[in-house]
Amino acid sequence: KAMHVAQPAVVLANSRGIASFVCEYASPGKATEVRVTVLRQADSQVTEVCAATYMMGNELTFLDDSICTGTSSGNQVNLTIQGLRAMDTGLYICKVELMYPPPYYMGIGNGTQIYVIDPEPCPDSD
């Protein structure tokens, strides 16, 4: 069967530019190695935000310079994206790939619309 991936429709980043959401997948197979990728869709262009491969039961490891962090629990991944600004508002898509053992499966969520509002600068005080 095709793999289903679920994620929230909308998330609001906090005042520090941090947004978190859960990406949940229904695994058709017994995967031991999973790859999670966050994609950003703006207009019709899709770009990769970050990606991590993890062993089931272990933590996700993103690259040191990644703006993403995450934790996994069963078929659920808790993703956090930081350093967001108003211009980063957009649709963030969770892609899950069951890499090992074969067969390979891929699932793509419908996307989470992340809204980012830049904080107002503090007024000067005399």
Partner: antibody, heavy 118, light 107 residues
Framework: EVQLVESGGGLVKPGGSLRLSCAAS????????MNWVRQAPGKGLEWVSS????????YYADSVKGRFTISRDNAKNSLYLQMNSLRAEDTAVYYC???????????WGQGTMVTVSS | EIVLTQSPGTLSLSPGERATLSCRAS??????LGWYQQKPGQAPRLLIY???TRATGIPDRFSGSGSGTDFTLTITRLEPEDFAVYYC?????????FGQGTKVEIK
């Protein structure tokens, strides 16, 4: 310009070997999974093999398993297919194809012809 | 292995007419289905992915629909350059599989 260019095809006898290459340009090759797809004369498309961006995960069609080996060299922006124990039914145009971020094969090379005949 | 069956095998139409191509999967592929166009002597070109999203640079006369096991590619007004072979492909699981193709020829 995003481009894939295959080479290495030719005429080989049954049981022989051949190594195909695919040179990538115009995109960050090391970020994408890659595939080989073949097309026998007058026939449809058949997926042959896939390799992940870092070569950690490799998949083969049952028809080539144990005979073909896919590999890549990210430093050289190149994809390879080592074909051993070739059979007449391996005669086809071989295409390399990039896996797009959303899953389909979004960029294809022009193909290289492999003929297995005595 | 997921088997994709395309119909009809050949479609004979005139420029300006509407083409409707079908692709049926042996089991659900959700929306992980793409459509490709191939002209003689050329490589396939991605037209549609995600069952209904046009790839970059594809004119809006091409549209895709469907989910699960039944999919359709529609070309609203055939242009001379649209006469070609069209393949569907599922990319949700390995082995990646293609349909046998539908040839759209000039009537």
């Amino acid at each position: 310009e995003v481009q894939l260019v295959e080479s290495g095809g030719g005429l080989v006898k049954p049981g022989g070997s051949l190594r195909l290459s695919c040179a990538a340009s115009g995109f960050t090759f090391s970020s994408y999974s890659m595939n080989w797809v073949r097309q026998a004369p007058g026939k449809g498309l058949e997926w042959v093999s896939s390799i992940s961006s870092s070569s950690s995960y490799i998949y083969y069609a049952d028809s080539v398993k144990g005979r073909f080996t896919i590999s890549r060299d990210n430093a050289k922006n190149s994809l390879y297919l080592q074909m051993n124990s070739l059979r007449a039914e391996d005669t086809a145009v071989y295409y390399c194809a990039r896996v797009g971020l959303m899953g389909p094969f979004d960029i294809w090379g022009q193909g290289t012809m492999v003929t297995v005949s005595s | 292995e997921i088997v994709l069956t395309q119909s009809p095998g050949t479609l004979s139409l005139s420029p300006g007419e509407r083409a409707t191509l079908s692709c049926r999967a042996s089991q659900s592929v959700s929306r992980y289905l793409g459509w490709y166009q191939q002209k003689p002597g050329q490589a396939p070109r991605l037209l549609i992915y995600g069952a209904s999203t046009r790839a970059t640079g594809i004119p809006d006369r091409f549209s895709g629909s469907g989910s699960g096991t039944d999919f359709t590619l529609t070309i609203t007004r055939l242009e001379p350059e649209d006469f070609a072979v069209y393949y569907c492909q599922q990319y949700g699981s390995s082995p990646w599989t293609f349909g046998q193709g539908t040839k759209v020829e000039i009537k």
